[in-house]
Each structure stands twice: as structure tokens, then as C-alpha cells.
């Protein structure tokens, strides 16, 4: 009897490591079978959407990463107040799971457009670099579905990198102009955003609580028009320490306002950055490692 | 023409109480925020107060915070200063002045307003 | 607070002498710096914005320059109606800061 007992045991452990190693392998076959589908990604050829099929829909990209999708690519998401899946780029780097909502990477899309494109969104949805603005109805539904972190990842001409993290991000709905709200600050870039930088200039400095301005939907607290000046759509102030929709520069630039991408806090107003990256992950993301 | 025009000068006792005016024309008043500045008899200027374009933001110099009030009437398109607990060192000529620009800048100026506090 | 220190507090110069007037912030201001005349018993006047900006209706022999913390007003050739006062003035943070002050006067 005992002996019976001690290899019911042993089968037992033989069973439950087969299971586990079964459950690596699937993790494994899925993640083959995503690379193999989208190896042309870093081929160069990426004019596609990674094709998930229908087996659910995913509310951001940290569900498609934990969901075992470890591969950084175009992929559909549709937020839970959203009325239509829409494509974004998720990168699954950086510990995964952060969905693109802007990027700036060479100048080729023009960001100087009007409020139903900023509303909708706009730009290149195919090409793993491509610029875009992801839409502030977009990132309302996004970001009212569970608290967010923002991460911006920045990079001058000369090769550095730097990056500026804000926990509660917040795009509020058309009723309010798409306003912005950032909580706790951190990183290496410096506080452009919420213009903590110097206690006295957050009057015409913070972007919190900013309305969205275009060139044809004028919300910001100066007499002037900010958009129309600076030739983007942002949360301008009077008008701003930090804009990463503004005209794209190659490093220092002189012009009539500081219309170039801008935050303030690492290259002031005079540097145009080269790269930008503007993404955002759950607050309590943790990774799915199974 | 842009004009600040401001109300009378004045003199006042020790701990007593008074609002100034400012009135604005020839620009629509309610998009640009305003302040006072002040300057004693010989001295050079100190600004005293702003008021955002909303009057949903004021800000004070630490010499008059607690004391001074800033407010405004965009549908008089005039602009306040309720001065409470004068002072001896309260005695200036007041100015109004329209915060202007990008870089906020002071354009243009009321004529000024002589307070005299003394007993 | 940021302090803006003038110099020279006072000058004395001739009709078409060229004028320097400096302004130091204690702190960066970028280029929120201005500056303004004042004539006695008057309200103070723009010259310039934003450091280096001629305000409209401005004469042109007065230019401005510099960014950060050292700033200079330059008058090229003083008229007569030049003789005043000139202040600096910080608009980089909201508790606003003039210089002290250069009175320039006829020699």
C-alpha cells in the first residue's frame, strides 16, 4: 500500500510537470506562430495589422501582451466605451504592454491640422516608426476605462534619451475639449508637463487641466491663439513648456514662436527633438508571465 | 485706441479701506489677464497683483497678500483693487496694466492713481 | 523671489552717446525679460518684449539682447526725449520683479 501511494505521488509530479511544460510549449507555438505571421516587421515590409482573429477584444495593448502577444507591432484594440475597434501600435518592449497614443520620428506627417483630425486621429498606422496622433476620442475612451500611466519616451539629435512618467493620465471628453489631467511625476526628462520646474510659473507654464486647442478650436488662456502660432493641436497654456506635436526641427531651429517639439525642462525652447514616443500602460500593470 | 483709464486719487487713514478702478476699452477685456503695480513717492515700481482673464486665478506680492483683493467685471470690462488695512508703506501711485503676450509682458498702462495713507 | 540687478544705477550721457544698460537675474528667465521707460510724473512705457523684441511705435535706437541672465538695453544714439528712467522687468514668474532701475540723465 505505501509503495502504491509513494507512485500515485510520483505520477502525480510527473503529471504536473508535464501540464506545465505543456503550458510553456502553447505559450511557446503562440509566440511562433505571431512571429511567424509578422516576421516581415523587422524586415522593414510593415504595412499590416497583426491579426489576432476574433477570439476577443482587447482594451488596450497590456490585455494583448498579457494574453501572451510578446511581439511590438500594429494590433486592433477597442476600449470598453469605444464604438469601433481601431488599430494602434503597441510596443511590447519596456516591459511591455504600453499602447502608442503619438509618435514623432522624422517629420513626415504634418501635425498642423484641425480639431476633427486631432478628434480622430490622423497619421501613418502601418510603419513600426510611423507618426501618428492616436485621437483624443480615442484617448478619452482609453484613459476613462482604468487609471493610466503616461510614459514619454524623448531622444535628441545628439543620441541621448531621455523620459518623463505621469500616473493618472486623463483626456477628458468633447464636452470638456479633450482636457488633460497627469498626476505624480517621474523620470529623467524633467516636469514639462504640469510646469513644476519653478513654483511661480504654473500659470502660464503647467499644461494640467488644459483644454485641447487646434488652430480652428481656440481653448487656451492666452489672448492670442497658441495653435495657430505654434502650428499643432496640444493642451496649450500661454502657450507651453512642452509640445511634442510642434513642427519638426532638426535639433536647434529659430523661428517666430518656440513652434519646434519641445520640453522645456531638458532642451528648453530652442530644440526641436528628434523622437518621440507618448504611451500608455495600466497604473497596476503587472505582466502575465505564464 | 487701447485705453486703461483709473479712478481718482485719493487719501486714506491708517487701517482704513479702499477699491481702486481701472476700465478698459478698445480691446475685448476679457481675453487678457491684468495686474497692479505700484510705486512709492521716489521709489521704483513693485507689482502688487494679477487676475487671470477669468478671474479664476489671482496671485499677490507678499506685501499686500491677505490685505489687497484683485477682481474684475468683464461686463464692465473693469478691473479692482479692494485695498483693506492700509498702511503707511501703502502710499503709491497705483497703476493698471494689461499683461500682454507670450512672455507676458505689461502694455499697455493705466495713468495711475495717487494713495495717500496717512492720519 | 527672482532679483533683477541694473547697472548703473544712474548715468550721465550727451545727445547722440551711445547708452548701455545691463540687467542681471538672480535665476534663468529664458527670455522673459522686458523693459520699459518711464518719464517723471508718467506711467511707464514698453520699449521691449521678450528681450529682445521692439514694441510697435518704438524708435529703432533702442534694441535689446540677451537670454538666460544677463540681458542688456542698448539705446544707439540718445535723443533728447531719451533722459528717463529705465526698468527691467521679469515675467518668467508670476511674482513679477522690476530691476531698481537706471536714471539716465543729461551730461
Known amino acids: 500500500l505505501e509503495d502504491c501511494a509513494q507512485e500515485q505521488m510520483r505520477l502525480r509530479a510527473q503529471v504536473r510537470l508535464l501540464e506545465t511544460r505543456v503550458k510553456q510549449q502553447q505559450v511557446k507555438i503562440k509566440q511562433l506562430l505571431q512571429e511567424n505571421e509578422v516576421q516581415f516587421l523587422d524586415k522593414g515590409d510593415e504595412n499590416t495589422v497583426i491579426d489576432l482573429g476574433s477570439k476577443r477584444q482587447y482594451a488596450d495593448c497590456s490585455e494583448i501582451f498579457n494574453d501572451g502577444y510578446k511581439l511590438s507591432g500594429f494590433y486592433k484594440i477597442k476600449p470598453l466605451q469605444s464604438p469601433a475597434e481601431f488599430s494602434v501600435y503597441c510596443d511590447m518592449s519596456d516591459g511591455g504592454g504600453w499602447t502608442v497614443i503619438q509618435r514623432r520620428s522624422d517629420g513626415s506627417e504634418n501635425f498642423n491640422r484641425g480639431w476633427k483630425d486631432y478628434e480622430n486621429g490622423f497619421g501613418n498606422f502601418v510603419q513600426k516608426h510611423g507618426e501618428y496622433w492616436l485621437g483624443n476620442k480615442n484617448l478619452h475612451f482609453l484613459t476613462t476605462q482604468e487609471d493610466y500611466t503616461l510614459k514619454i519616451d524623448l531622444a535628441d539629435f545628439e543620441k541621448n534619451s531621455r523620459y518623463a512618467q505621469y500616473k493618472n493620465f486623463k483626456v477628458g471628453d468633447e464636452k470638456n475639449f479633450y482636457e488633460l489631467n497627469i498626476g505624480e511625476y517621474s523620470g529623467t526628462a524633467g516636469d514639462s508637463l504640469a510646469g513644476n520646474f519653478h513654483p511661480e510659473v504654473q500659470w502660464w507654464a503647467s499644461h494640467q487641466r488644459m483644454k485641447f486647442s487646434t488652430w480652428d478650436r481656440d481653448h487656451d488662456n492666452y489672448e492670442g491663439n497658441c495653435a495657430e502660432e505654434d502650428q499643432s493641436g496640444w493642451w496649450f497654456n500661454r502657450c507651453h513648456s512642452a509640445n511634442l506635436n510642434g513642427v519638426y526641427y532638426s535639433g536647434p531651429y529659430t523661428a517666430k514662436t518656440d513652434n519646434g517639439i519641445v520640453w522645456y525642462t531638458w532642451h528648453g525652447w530652442w530644440y526641436s527633438l528628434k523622437s518621440v514616443v507618448m504611451k500608455i500602460r495600466p497604473n497596476d500593470f503587472i505582466p502575465n508571465v505564464i | 485706441e487701447v485705453q486703461l483709464v483709473q479712478s481718482g486719487g485719493v487719501v486714506v487713514q491708517p487701517g482704513g479701506s479702499l477699491r481702486l478702478s481701472c476700465a478698459a476699452s478698445g480691446f475685448t477685456f476679457d481675453d487678457y489677464a491684468m495686474h497692479w503695480v505700484r510705486q512709492a513717492p521716489g521709489k521704483g515700481l513693485e507689482w502688487v497683483s494679477l487676475?487671470?482673464?477669468?478671474?479664476?486665478?489671482?496671485y499677490y506680492a507678499d506685501s499686500v497678500k491677505g490685505r489687497f483683493t484683485i477682481s474684475r467685471d468683464n461686463s464692465k470690462n473693469t478691473l479692482y483693487l479692494q485695498m483693506n488695512s492700509l498702511r503707511a508703506e501703502d502710499t503709491a501711485v497705483y497703476y493698471c496694466?494689461?499683461?500682454?503676450?507670450?512672455?507676458?509682458?505689461?502694455?499697455?498702462w493705466g495713468q495711475g492713481t495717487l494713495v495717500t495713507v496717512s492720519s | 523671489d527672482i532679483q533683477l540687478t541694473q547697472s548703473p544705477s544712474s548715468l550721465s550721457a550727451s545727445v547722440g552717446d551711445r547708452v548701455t544698460i545691463t540687467c542681471r537675474a538672480s535665476?534663468?528667465?529664458?527670455?522673459?525679460l522686458n523693459w520699459y521707460q518711464q518719464k517723471p510724473g508718467k506711467a511707464p512705457k514698453l520699449l521691449i518684449y521678450?528681450?529682445?523684441s521692439l514694441q510697435s511705435g518704438v524708435p529703432s535706437r533702442f534694441s535689446g539682447s540677451g537670454s538666460g541672465t544677463d540681458f542688456t538695453l542698448t539705446i544707439s544714439s540718445l535723443q533728447p526725449e531719451d533722459f528717463a528712467t529705465y526698468y527691467c522687468?521679469?515675467?518668467?514668474?508670476?511674482?513679477?520683479?522690476f530691476g531698481q532701475g537706471t536714471k539716465v540723465e543729461i551730461k
Open positions: 535665476q534663468s528667465i529664458s527670455s522673459y
Open positions: 487676475i487671470s482673464w477669468d478671474g479664476g486665478s489671482t
Open positions: 522687468q521679469q515675467s518668467y514668474s508670476t511674482l513679477w520683479t
Open positions: 496694466a494689461r499683461n500682454s503676450g507670450r512672455r507676458n509682458w505689461f502694455d499697455p
Open positions: 521678450a528681450a529682445s
